[in-house]
Amino acid sequence: RGVFRRDAHKSEVAHRFKDLGEENFKALVLIAFAQYLQQCPFEDHVKLVNEVTEFAKTCVADESAENCDKSLHTLFGDKLCTVATLRETYGEMADCCAKQEPERNECFLQHKDDNPNLPRLVRPEVDVMCTAFHDNEETFLKKYLYEIARRHPYFYAPELLFFAKRYKAAFTECCQAADKAACLLPKLDELRDEGKASSAKQRLKCASLQKFGERAFKAWAVARLSQRFPKAEFAEVSKLVTDLTKVHTECCHGDLLECADDRADLAKYICENQDSISSKLKECCEKPLLEKSHCIAEVENDEMPADLPSLAADFVESKDVCKNYAEAKDVFLGMFLYEYARRHPDYSVVLLLRLAKTYETTLEKCCAAADPHECYAKVFDEFKPLVEEPQNLIKQNCELFEQLGEYKFQNALLVRYTKKVPQVSTPTLVEVSRNLGKVGSKCCKHPEAKRMPCAEDYLSVVLNQLCVLHEKTPVSDRVTKCCTESLVNRRPCFSALEVDETYVPKEFNAETFTFHADICTLSEKERQIKKQTALVELVKHKPKATKEQLKAVMDDFAAFVEKCCKADDKETCFAEEGKKLVAASQAALGL
């Protein structure tokens, strides 16, 4: 089972259909197909899913029937390769169909598009949605899975089933309510925001496996699970890490049926063994499967065991450090990471991984030295600056956030990041900086002990968005360098970037700063994005502009929008006042 299969079942498709049940089987196949062929119409995918489902049923009835012994990738890939418009719609992705498995599947995976050219999802009126829901609930929910999966090709499939369940519950409840909109819209907003966050978190897991490999993912999982389950033994944590790695490897590799099945098995194991894992799992384990798995993934850290001994005894003072390290390097480093992480729920996972890397580097050097013990005796002193760097950064940025508020804090980050990497596209800089800025509201409210894990691990997720978007169309060597050199040092790498002195300022284009009356009907969020887009463009034109200059121009711009949106003839106001604003801004910035 899994990516590297040991074929234990005569028919893999029958096995998964029976394990998952028809409803989940169909939903997961739809997600898989939509994540591979992101441009195909809904109806085409539904047709393919129905064909696969009918075939699976024949295999359930008789596992020896023709083609039932084929691998899931062979069955699904053959089905995807029947799509008539593959060459016209997807171009070179069609070449994947000339390959054999498993090359064909990995070829499809490599063509997944993190930023597909799809229209923004526009939310219809509540009454329209409720009618559609009541008219055909099944199609309505399938459409939800399809639209999310094609826009988020790495969305964690079993978790998307959980979102769909909540989506259905929201409509079931709210379409009967007296005030449908008041009931439904906040729920949909919450699902949208949680969904984006879930997608981004999973994208980092897949990027970790894709670019840095199984060892990097396992190290991350050891650190995180040790923080979450500090009472669990190392052997227990290691078992959970192995199983969790398998689950995420499968989902990131497009093996969604196996992934969902193995995730359910893992939740079952955790709940059956909660006494030796964590005291915080009781409530989670009373829930139905999808809720249970979600709950376990989000469960709060258990309390640390009392009287944990000093780490120095086993990892610095012991005379057997080099012997233990040489005997089983990965196990010894894994134990170090486990012991350090369970004692430090106040550290980010990436910081813990940096400390483990420093410890490994020290042992590699010192265990070959004349006096190893003397050489590594002060290794823990090397950790101090590594710990202080994110602490200081978070302190400074939380102070700035509290002073400015979210919107202006985002603007400060927009300016900062545009100056660091001005070659990056404006939409990407806006999206990433807005998300970086959300760290303030998300994490600065927490007490000191929770700030770093909240902030730095969130920043890792957001910077990964920058990395995957940039990888599609690379434009900056500095971004490539920070994204590829070290997974755990991405944030310090970006933090350390100064203004790019090699950048040749963009030519001034008045069209970029021409606005129309349609801005007045936009939501507050959309209006902010328009203004932030203009801010990035300003910095690209004038990278040496001071904060004061940029603030003055942005204040003038805000006043201009406010004035023209109140005018009787809005369009004329935007045309005339806009010209004046552009001229004044050029003068203010010396363009």
Epitope: E106, Q110, G213, E214
Partner: nanobody, 125 residues
């Protein structure tokens, strides 16, 4: 640094067998994945099979499943490819490769950092 040396190639008749060996020297820890690729004249390099050092999990190209078997001997730092029921279309230069990180995509040659020099396998009809 890891050095890989393949041997065991040669000329064989269709239906015959060969056993390729790959000797790995240098640091090959448990995180490694070892793969076999092949390249026929005028064609792209093609994935054949892979095995994880740590747990021995294996994967194969569809057309060699049931005919080829990959295995490893951790103590000797060796990886083997037993090739049975050989066909003329199996003719190619066979390369041993190592991915020190066991990255997600195991059929992608770019994910393998270390390569042997290759050994020729010719299957005559």
């Amino acid at each position: 640094e890891v050095q890989l040396v393949e041997f065991g190639g040669g000329l064989v008749q269709a239906g015959g067998s060969l056993r390729l060996s790959c000797a790995a020297s240098g640091r090959t820890d448990s995180a490694y994945r070892m793969g076999w690729f092949r390249q026929a004249p005028g064609k792209e390099r093609e994935f054949v099979s892979a095995i994880n050092w740590s747990d021995g999990r294996t994967v194969y190209l569809d057309s060699v499943k049931g005919r080829f078997t990959i295995s490893r001997d951790n103590a000797k730092n060796m990886v083997y490819l037993q090739m049975n029921s050989l066909k003329p279309e199996d003719t190619a230069v066979y390369y041993c490769a190592a991915d020190p990180d066991s990255r997600l995509y195991y059929t992608v040659p770019q994910n393998y950092d270390y390569w042997g020099q290759g050994t020729q396998v010719t299957v005559s009809s």
